[in-house]
């Protein structure tokens, strides 16, 4: 029950996290430009990964794609890439984890398969979260190093007069959304990995074993107990307590002439 709860919670937390990463990637407020020391603030400017926006004092707001004549900074391209990789990995992770959920039955899927899928999705969520956190952190660093406390003269309108203002680029809401979302995805991934340990059948679990008496083709299956005879070759480097006993699958896969009791 605890495993199912951990897995389910991990899935939900990751889902919220990935939704947040998508939201952050699409948001326009990655950096905002505060204008102060200005009696009449002409514009409030903010930028996202894809476009730049201007809000005039009248309330009129307009967003436009970046002016790429001079090219886009490599850092911006790297952040875009990190966020997209994070979203793609997260989306694949969600898809895998849906099928891995213990509460959902799909055909005769075994717990071992679900455990593997849970681990896979968990790792994907962890990498996805790390990509988002890295992307947002790179952008924040770019803001701090390149744009913090810059000054400008603002000339408004065609043939407009000089209006001196000081601009300061600050962290936009998207950065905080991205950090939180990345963290949630990471936590969700860790929870999925923890749940995987509970789902995976232990090596010491009792397996149904087949015994072949010489000259007979009768398979005797004790009710889930693992018996050890101490006989049989250990050529497959099996643990010695397995003895000559093999699971039904192993018997089918590796027929042997030396299984005696």
């Amino acid at each position: 029950m605890a495993v199912t709860a951990c897995q389910g919670l991990g899935f939900v937390v990751s889902l919220i996290g990935i939704a947040g990463i998508i939201a952050a990637t699409c948001m326009d407020q990655w950096s905002t430009q505060d204008l102060y020391n200005n009696p009449v603030t002409a514009v409030f400017n903010y930028q996202g990964l894809w476009r730049s926006c201007v809000r005039e004092s009248s309330g009129f707001t307009e967003c436009r794609g970046y002016f790429t004549l001079l090219g886009l900074p490599a850092m911006l391209q790297a952040v875009r890439a990190l966020m997209i990789v994070g979203i793609v990995l997260g989306a694949i992770g969600l898809l895998v984890s849906i099928f891995a959920l213990k509460c959902i039955r799909i055909g005769s899927m075994e717990d071992s398969a679900k455990a593997n899928m849970t681990l896979t999705s968990g790792i994907m969520f962890i990498v996805s979260g790390l990509c988002a956190i890295a992307g947002v952190s790179v952008f924040a660093n770019m803001l701090v190093t390149n744009f913090w406390m810059s000054t400008a003269n603002m000339y408004t309108g065609m043939g407009g007069m000089v209006q001196t203002v000081q601009t300061r680029y600050t962290f936009g809401a998207a950065l905080f959304v991205g950090w939180v979302a990345g963290g949630l995805t990471l936590i969700g991934g860790v929870m999925m990995c923890i749940a995987c340990r509970g789902l995976a059948p232990e090596e010491t679990n009792y397996k149904a074993v087949s015994y072949h008496a010489s000259g007979h083709s009768v398979a005797y299956k004790p009710g889930g107990f693992k018996a050890s005879t101490g006989f049989g070759s250990n050529t497959k480097n099996k643990k010695i307590y397995d003895g000559g006993a093999r699971t039904e699958d192993e018997v089918q896969s590796y027929p042997s002439k030396h299984d005696y009791v």
């Epitope: 307009e62 436009r64 970046y66 002016f67 790429t68 001079l70 090219g71 900074p73 000054t151 400008a152």
Partner: nanobody
């Protein structure tokens, strides 16, 4: 730090033509347009032409230069141009290139400025 560099400024006769160029030493984040400003002796710096991310169709001009000046960009050369035709003596001044923010209503300058290039138009 990214720097904008203007060139092409020189002396010309009234009625003549000049083409100013503006190139950058690197790429600039966050801009949605670029503009050309003119500062005549003893006057304030004024915006005379601007271009937005929509390309050559996304342009604005001051009334004093409409029909005579054309702003354009060469994406392959990463250069902004100002083609100035039918020059007048009042077009004289220092021309500055700027990277800023364009809207359908207006152009707002950003933090990046060139050092300026002098244009002198003789009568």
């Amino acid at each position: 730090q990214v720097q904008l560099v203007e060139s092409g400024g020189q002396s010309a006769q009234a009625g003549g033509s000049l083409r100013l160029s503006c190139t950058a030493s690197g790429s600039i984040f966050g801009i949605s347009g670029m503009g050309w400003y003119r500062q005549a002796p003893g006057k304030e710096r004024e915006l005379i032409a601007a271009i937005g991310s929509g390309g050559d169709g996304d342009t604005k001009y001051a009334e004093s230069v409409k029909g005579r000046f054309t702003i354009s960009g060469d994406y392959a050369k990463k250069t902004l141009y100002l083609q100035m035709n039918s020059l007048k003596p009042e077009d004289s001044g220092v021309y500055y290139c700027n990277a800023g923010f364009m809207t359908s209503r207006n152009y707002y300058n950003g933090d990046y400025w060139g050092q300026g290039t002098q244009v002198t138009v003789a009568a």
